[in-house]
């Protein structure tokens, strides 16, 4: 999947952009908005009715080197009196982001984008019953 | 990749950290090939607590498309599809990284960027603090 | 426990006002954020107005936006919803809440959500 060239209509090429190699870019992983403020509401892992558990996940070759994933912790959803209804169902909500990953080939190394798919939490939902004809 | 040529003692300065600026290759490696969007794709309907799904564009940013999740209802679905008040639709958020043009609309120079998304929305019990 | 109390509503006429109180008990407002809510007869519970003491940020709702004011006496632990230029429209039951999130980003149906305590309400009706 390669990322798009700006589209001529739009964007015009200033004089300023550095020169690149062929079929390669320039990536600054100085990251913009590093400590950002996040509101999210507290302990809501635990709080759902399709609750989760969080594991880190560590590759030193891989920019982020963490990366936090949610495990939904029942195959069904906790009802008002904390037991699990199996005729519910807790299912991942998942989301893409990018990382830098470092390849070693030899006594070289290379820079690769990489698409990495994030399970973020839980969210429980009514199944969905596919009738046969 | 783009191979860039290591120290002349390569074996022992095994760097730790990643260099401030890399060259890397215009092909973005998708590690996402096992998952099954027909199924997760209405979730955001069926779930208790459901969400809406904004467009977000930037043709200045990689993705320039994000959609962004919004709770429809303060309080969750109950079995009998009325919203239940006693209970709260919560959205669950995620940091990103995106790609930024830097210097702007340059096509092939970037720098990363965190950004802060609402991917879905969940159904939780209310916490109360009691005060001492 | 945590507890609120809404008084003030009634019946007024359209283009009039009344103030709404607010009186939290079990807690103060340094523990939670508030959120001014309402429910019409057949509709859902919509969110008017937020507030956090932390900072003093407020937050309406575009329907209210300009007539609604929100302010708070931390003595008297009471958050009070001025509300001014009232139309029919603006007749529901009001209610005021203890929440823990208040995100001007507003991914939720509301920015502050996440409610912890609901009071039980107070009526208002305007006429035309």
């Known amino acids: 999947r390669k990322i798009p060239k700006v589209g001529h209509t739009f964007f015009q090429k200033p004089e300023s952009c550095p020169p690149v190699p062929g079929g390669s870019m320039k990536l600054d992983i100085g990251i913009i908005n590093e400590n950002q403020r996040v509101s999210m509401s507290r302990n809501i892992e635990s709080r759902s009715t399709s609750p989760w558990n969080y594991t880190v996940t560590w590759d030193p070759n891989r920019y982020p080197s963490e990366v936090v994933q949610a495990q939904c912790r029942n195959l069904g959803c906790i009802n008002a009196q904390g037991k699990e209804d199996i005729s519910m169902n807790s299912v991942p909500i998942q989301q893409e982001t990018l990382v830098v990953r470092r390849k070693h080939q030899g006594c070289s190394v290379s820079f690769q984008l990489e698409k990495v798919l994030v399970t973020v939490g839980c969210t429980c939902v009514t199944p969905v019953i596919h009738h046969v004809q | 990749g783009i191979t860039i040529p290591r120290n002349p003692g390569c074996p022992n300065s095994e760097d730790k950290n990643f260099p401030r600026t890399v060259m890397v290759n215009l092909n973005i490696h998708n590690r996402n090939t096992n998952t099954n969007p027909k199924r997760s794709s209405d979730y955001y309907n069926r779930s208790t607590s459901p969400w809406n799904l904004h467009r977000n564009e930037d043709p200045e940013r990689y993705p320039s498309v994000i959609w962004e999740a919004k709770c429809r209802h303060l309080g969750c679905i109950n079995a009998d599809g009325n919203v239940d008040y006693h209970m709260n639709s919560v959205p669950i958020q995620q940091e990103i990284l995106v790609l930024r043009r830097e210097p702007p609309h340059c096509p092939n120079s970037f720098r990363l960027e965190k950004i802060l998304v609402s991917v879905g929305c969940t159904c939780v019990t209310p916490i109360v603090h009691h005060v001492a | 426990e945590v507890q609120l109390v809404e008084s003030g509503g009634g019946l007024v006429q359209a283009g009039g006002s009344l103030r709404l109180s607010c009186a939290a008990s079990?807690?103060?407002?340094?523990?939670?954020?508030i959120g001014w809510f309402r429910q019409a007869p057949g509709k859902e519970r919509e969110g008017v107005s937020c507030?956090?003491?932390?900072?003093?940020?407020?937050f309406y709702a575009d329907s209210v936006k300009g007539r609604f004011t929100v302010s708070a006496d931390n003595a008297k632990n009471t958050v009070y919803l001025q509300m001014n230029s009232l139309e029919p429209e603006d007749t529901a039951v009001y209610f005021c809440?203890?929440?823990?999130?208040?995100?001007?980003?507003?991914?939720?149906?509301?920015?502050?959500?996440?409610?912890?305590?609901w009071g039980q309400g107070t009526q208002v009706t305007v006429s035309s």
């Open positions: 809440a203890a929440v823990n999130t208040f995100d001007e980003s507003a991914y939720a149906a509301f920015a502050c959500y996440d409610v912890v305590r």
């Open positions: 079990g807690f103060t407002f340094d523990d939670y954020d």
């Open positions: 507030f956090t003491s932390s900072d003093g940020r407020t």
